[in-house]
């Protein structure tokens, strides 16, 4: 029985993007006083995980640490809420997270078509390019939350490419991007090297976020 | 350099259990899962489950399920496999492996022979 | 469970000729989850291919996989002496994970 309770949160601590063989927290939390977290992750079998909920301040929370990411915990994970000691009572299912593994192949290129500065109001299109014969090119940018995600292209210069178009300039912003294969999904590229995006004639520092981002991630909230 | 080294060969009776073990080195075991292949004499490859040691749930082909145990113990990074009610058609190389989708490391292989 | 079919079940060659494996699988493989294995006698398999078309770490040039859905090919361009061994598919795109049959690739 599913859904007794309202959905906990799940999120990833430093983030869910995790270099190989580092650490990453993933915490359940909730303001439910929740006895048990169940941690899932989706895929053919079944990982689940019971963690035992601690109380403080108001709320619930469970951690699971990952001391060494590999590819095989790489994936969509969810979690639920137990008040109960049956397994059957358990809340609606957290927002999904994607856990992604990076820094597995060499990483791609990232260059501004127009150059790395550009007047406001300007079209800006970011390339990410590589050798290496990447499905999918995944576009992140410094403080935000979801990538952008295109499918690379061969060109005739021998590399594999994807062209981002990010609309007219207004803000600037660092950014970075991956390639990944379409049978792994959850496995990245090493980063680009990152890339500053100035924007002349406006004096913030900060891209809008895009209205439609590629990629799931949990709510930003602070771990306690 | 990751290596994976089982424990040796075992001769079974019909009816029993045997318990081949897996022993890790060289890399991060609690985050890979191993699963265990085996491979009857001149016959092909058959995978019957696997594990990830950080999850600790094991997960088993149909055709073994109810007859095959996998645990794996983290602290001296081994896993288990546990066959029971052995029969002769159960003699076969058991093989460990890294991971549960395409296997980039094997064991030795451990050879049980089920005779009465 | 997926059932895949291995053909030739055996291919004599000689050594500096070209080799084509086929595997079929009874259903479509999903995001080309499939890989090879070379075996040797009295040896564990050894990954060559995977993701259909990936090499793995090590193995040589002339050994290529392509194919998607339910047909996949392992292709071998020039034999050498340390090529002549069984050949195994493996899907691990659903649960079970299955192996095909094998294809034994012999010295004519």
């Known amino acids: 029985h599913e859904g007794v309770h309202r959905k906990p949160s799940l999120l990833a601590h430093p983030g869910r993007l995790v270099k190989s063989e580092e650490t990453v927290i993933l915490q359940c939390w909730s303001d439910v006083m929740f006895e048990h977290f169940l941690l899932h992750r989706e895929g053919m079998f079944n990982d689940t995980l019971r963690l035992i909920g601690e109380h403080h301040d108001g709320v619930s929370k469970a951690n699971f640490s990952i001391s060494r990411m590999t590819q095989d915990l790489a994936g969509t994970y969810r979690c639920y809420g137990s008040v109960t000691h049956s397994p059957y009572q358990v809340s609606a299912p957290s927002d999904p997270l994607d856990i992604v593994i990076i820094g597995l192949y060499e990483k791609p290129s990232l260059s501004a078509q127009l150059g790395p500065t550009v007047l406001a109001g300007e079209n800006v299109t970011l390339s990410c390019s590589s050798r290496s014969s990447y499905d999918m090119y995944h576009l992140s940018r410094e403080g935000e939350a979801h990538e952008r995600r295109l499918p690379a292209g061969p060109k005739v210069n021998g590399t594999f490419q994807a062209d981002f178009p990010l609309g007219p300039a207004t803000h600037g912003g660092t950014y970075r991007c991956f390639g990944s294969f379409h049978d792994s999904p959850y496995e990245w590229s090493k980063s680009s090297d990152p890339l500053l995006v100035s924007v002349t004639g406006n004096p913030s520092n900060s891209w809008p976020s895009p209205t439609e981002p590629s990629s799931k991630t949990g709510n930003p909230r602070h771990l306690h | 350099q990751v290596q994976l080294v089982q424990s040796g060969a075992e001769v079974k009776k019909p009816g029993s259990s045997v318990k081949v073990s897996c022993k890790a080195s060289?890399?991060?075991?609690?985050?890979?899962?191993i699963s265990w292949v085996r491979q009857a004499p001149g016959q092909g490859l058959e995978w019957m489950g696997g594990?990830?040691?950080?999850?600790?749930?094991?997960n088993y082909a149909q055709k073994f399920q109810g007859r095959v145990t996998i645990t794996a113990d983290e602290s001296t990074s081994t896993a288990y496999m546990e066959l029971s009610s052995l029969r002769s058609e159960d003699t076969a190389v058991y093989y460990c492996?890294?991971?549960?989708?395409?296997?980039?490391?094997w064991g030795q292989g451990t050879l049980v022979t089920v005779s009465s | 469970e997926i059932v895949l079919t291995q053909s030739p079940g055996t291919l004599s060659l000689s050594p500096g000729e070209g080799a084509t494996l086929s595997c079929r699988a009874s259903?479509?493989?999903?995001?080309?989850?499939l890989a090879w294995y070379q075996q040797k006698p009295g040896q564990a398999p050894r990954l060559l291919i995977y993701g259909a078309s990936r090499r793995a770490t090590g193995i040589p040039d002339r050994f290529s996989g392509s194919g998607s859905g339910t047909d996949f090919t392992l292709t071998i361009s020039r034999l050498e002496p340390e090529d002549f061994a069984v050949y195994y598919c493996q899907q691990y795109g659903s649960s079970p994970l299955t192996f095909g049959g094998g294809t034994k690739v012999e010295i004519k």
């Open positions: 492996a890294r991971s549960r989708s395409y296997f980039d490391y």
């Open positions: 060289g890399g991060t075991f609690s985050s890979y899962a």
């Open positions: 594990i990830i040691p950080i999850f600790g749930t094991a």
């Open positions: 259903q479509s493989v999903t995001s080309s989850h």
